[in-house]
Interface confidence: low
């Protein structure tokens, strides 16, 4: 047993350009505060997994009010330290998450509301007993800075907490066998209560003479490193003469998963997958509740209506899972009609509408030539979302009111002259070229290169262009 | 600041189904959980279900049999259905906001009486 | 379904001084608990939730404790305004109930 410990030193802007700004004004005051999560290893676990190895909620930071014109400082920060205890062995390498969350403190009925400000995760190796951890993570352009470590409680000693040390029987020395607890030089280790030869830096025992081994050890004293290598089999003691490991049984051989959780291998060692209620390495911890804090995302944590179901969190707007940890792409159901752009703003969904259309998801078309009239014998044209009009020879612009010179644009090439006609425009050719824009070069002997002029024209003939 | 607003008959016949509906004055009925919760004249409150926008709903068990909740987020609206009435259920019918981080009753309607007599 | 229990049903209280009112659950409901204030004709106000902590905008003078099976709502100073019915309601299990209500009277 012990406690993992996260003091959080800064929450501020990170470096670089994009400065956020202040979560609070001075018409709505906010103050922060902090939860984490921890989970046992560093294999990737699904994100609704339960905070196995426990969470904690830190108290409230004090109110701040920003500063008109200033940018967004190191926020004020609650007091003290972040505590997780743990009832099981330190298992060494951990997965954390840290939420920064700000309590809005307006004048709102009910209390307070609550927004998550940045989420950061990640995935640690660390000792009991070892020294602080500084850390920082950015999520996005907010920067967290923090530290943390494992301790023992006592009488637990040891890098996982698994070794059991007690206050000295006698002033001078320890008991026959038992060495003395460093860095607790005034205890000893308690009485073997493990099974004879279990490793004490990577087995520990809850009953004596059992020997249950940390993630990446097996064997029944736990003195076997669960490898990968070249070998035909992944399993078993380690063979001395040629280093591979040769068949002998597979972690999940007897099922190590207590209380009916189901085992499955992995690479290093082997999972535990449990049924709701009960959770740690071997699902040995039972009774997870509300006060445990499983719920996250400010999902709402209800107990159980029946003792299979300890706990039951709700989870709010755009988020899902058993324990509200996966956020929902909520606009992958394609709510917006019509080409609208879906926004998922968190707290609400919000659909961006192409011209032409409007409603909550875009489902009103718009009459784009209710009332609009297009001139000079141009018709209205619904395409869209947008009004257009197609316009009459000689005529264009947007309502077909500008009078239309099919010259302006240079439509006759190699020097053609342009000229503009009732039905649109003509070019009259230089020497030695031809075609409705004068496009294609006449060749010397008189023979037009394709396509071929039409029949009735000669070469060099004004061409109109219909 | 959101105001919730009850409407339906006062007066419904045993063996009846009384209706009744909410009215979300603003856009938030995507965003929380909303509730019913009835008083008898000079009585306590009781729960009878709450709705959120997903569809989740969720009832008391003695009352789960007859009553139906629902929830038009077009229209802001969430509904109540009580079929099968009887005196027993005469009442001031209160629509209400779950708060965000606890099943607790943050914002309430003013309450619309309803009479059951023939 | 979890029993909520108010005592007592009547406090007969002066203005100025301190009432304290009692809730009782069946079984334990950790800190889920809320305090409501009821004036007649009027709708339930939410006052204190989690058990201890208070809605925002209402007075210091009114503070939540307890936990588990045991809580107190405790106005250290009766206002005229807060001679009222008072309720206390669990949200740790299914269903969601509400205790039968404390009447604070002007003594």
């Known amino acids: 047993a012990g406690v993992f410990e996260l003091q959080i030193h800064s929450f501020g802007p990170g470096p670089g350009p994009g400065a956020p700004r202040s979560p609070c004004s001075a018409r709505l005051p906010c103050r922060l505060f902090f939860r984490v999560c921890l989970k046992p290893g560093l294999s990737e676990e699904a994100a609704e997994s339960p905070c196995a190895l426990g969470a904690a909620l830190s108290a409230r930071g004090p109110v701040y009010t920003e500063q008109p014109g200033a940018p967004a400082p190191d926020l004020p920060l609650p007091d003290g330290l972040l505590q997780v205890p743990f009832r099981d062995a330190w298992p060494g390498t951990f997965s954390f998450i840290i939420e920064t969350w700000r309590e809005e403190l307006g004048d709102q009925i009910g209390g307070p509301a609550w927004s998550l400000l940045a989420r950061v995760a990640g995935r640690r190796r660390l000792a009991a007993g070892g020294p602080w951890a500084r850390d920082i993570q950015r999520a996005g352009a907010w920067e967290l800075r923090f530290s943390y470590r494992a301790r023992c409680e006592p009488p637990a000693v040891g890098t996982a907490c698994t070794r059991l040390c007690r206050p000295r029987s006698a002033p001078s020395r320890c008991g026959p066998g038992l060495r003395p607890c460093a860095p607790l030089e005034d205890e000893c280790e308690a009485p073997l209560v493990c099974r004879a030869g279990c490793s004490p830096e990577h087995g520990f025992c809850e009953q004596p003479g059992e020997c249950r081994c940390l993630e990446g050890w097996t064997g029944p004293l736990c003195t076997v490193p669960v490898s990968t290598s070249s070998c035909l089999s992944p399993r078993g003691p380690s063979s001395a003469t040629t280093g591979c490991l040769v068949p002998g049984p597979g972690p999940c051989d007897g099922n190590p998963c207590a209380n009916g959780g189901s085992c499955s291998e992995t690479p290093r060692s082997f999972e535990c997958t449990c049924p709701r209620g009960f959770y740690g390495l071997r699902c040995e911890v039972s009774g997870v509740t509300c006060a445990d804090g499983p719920c996250f995302n400010g999902g709402l944590c209800v107990g159980g209506a029946d003792p299979d179901s300890a706990y039951i969190c709700h989870c709010p707007p755009g988020f899902q899972g058993s324990n509200c940890e996966k956020r929902v792409d909520r606009c992958s159901l394609q709510p917006c009609r019509n080409g609208g752009l879906c926004l998922d703003l968190g707290h609400a969904l919000r659909c961006r509408c192409r011209a032409g259309f409007a409603g909550p998801r875009c489902e009103h078309d718009l009459d784009d030539c209710a009332g609009r009239a297009c001139a000079n014998g141009g018709t209205c044209v619904e395409g869209g979302g947008a009004h257009r009009c197609s316009c009459a020879l000689g005529f264009g612009g947007r309502d077909c009111r500008e009078r239309a010179d099919p010259c302006a644009a240079r439509p006759c090439a190699h020097g053609g002259r342009c000229y503009a006609h009732f039905s649109g425009l003509v070019c009259a050719c230089a020497p030695g070229y031809m075609g409705a824009r004068c496009e294609f070069p006449v060749h010397p002997d008189g023979a037009s290169a394709l396509p071929a002029a039409p029949p009735g024209l000669r070469p060099g003939d004004p061409q109109r262009y219909l | 600041q959101v105001q919730l607003q009850e409407s339906g008959p006062g007066l419904v016949k045993p063996s009846e189904t009384l209706s009744l509906t909410c009215t979300v004055s603003d856009n938030s009925i995507s965003n929380y959980y909303w509730s019913w919760i009835r008083q008898p004249p000079g009585k306590g409150l009781e729960w009878i279900a709450y709705i959120y926008y997903s569809g989740t709903t969720n009832y008391n068990p003695s009352l789960k049999s007859r009553v139906t909740i629902s929830l038009d987020t077009s229209k802001n609206q969430f509904s109540l259905k009580l079929s099968s009435v009887t005196a027993a259920d005469t009442a001031v019918y209160y629509c209400?906001?779950?708060?965000?981080?606890?099943?607790?009753?943050?914002?309430w309607g003013q309450g619309t009486m309803v009479t059951v007599s023939s | 379904e979890i029993v909520m229990t108010q005592s007592p049903a009547t406090l007969s209280v002066s203005p100025g001084e301190r009432a304290t009112l009692s809730c009782r659950a069946s079984q334990s409901v950790s800190s889920n608990l809320a305090w409501y204030q009821q004036k007649p004709g009027q709708a339930p106000r939410l006052l204190i939730y989690?058990?201890?902590t208070r809605a925002t905008g209402i007075p210091a003078r009114f503070s939540g404790s307890g936990s588990g099976t045991e809580f107190t709502l405790t106005i250290s100073s009766l206002q005229s305004e807060d001679f009222a019915v008072y309720y206390c309601?669990?949200?740790?299990?299914?269903?969601?109930?509400f205790g039968g209500g404390t009447k604070v009277e002007i003594k």
């Open positions: 989690g058990a201890s």
């Open positions: 209400a906001r779950l708060f965000n981080w606890g099943f607790a009753f943050d914002i």
């Open positions: 309601q669990q949200y740790n299990n299914w269903p969601l109930t």
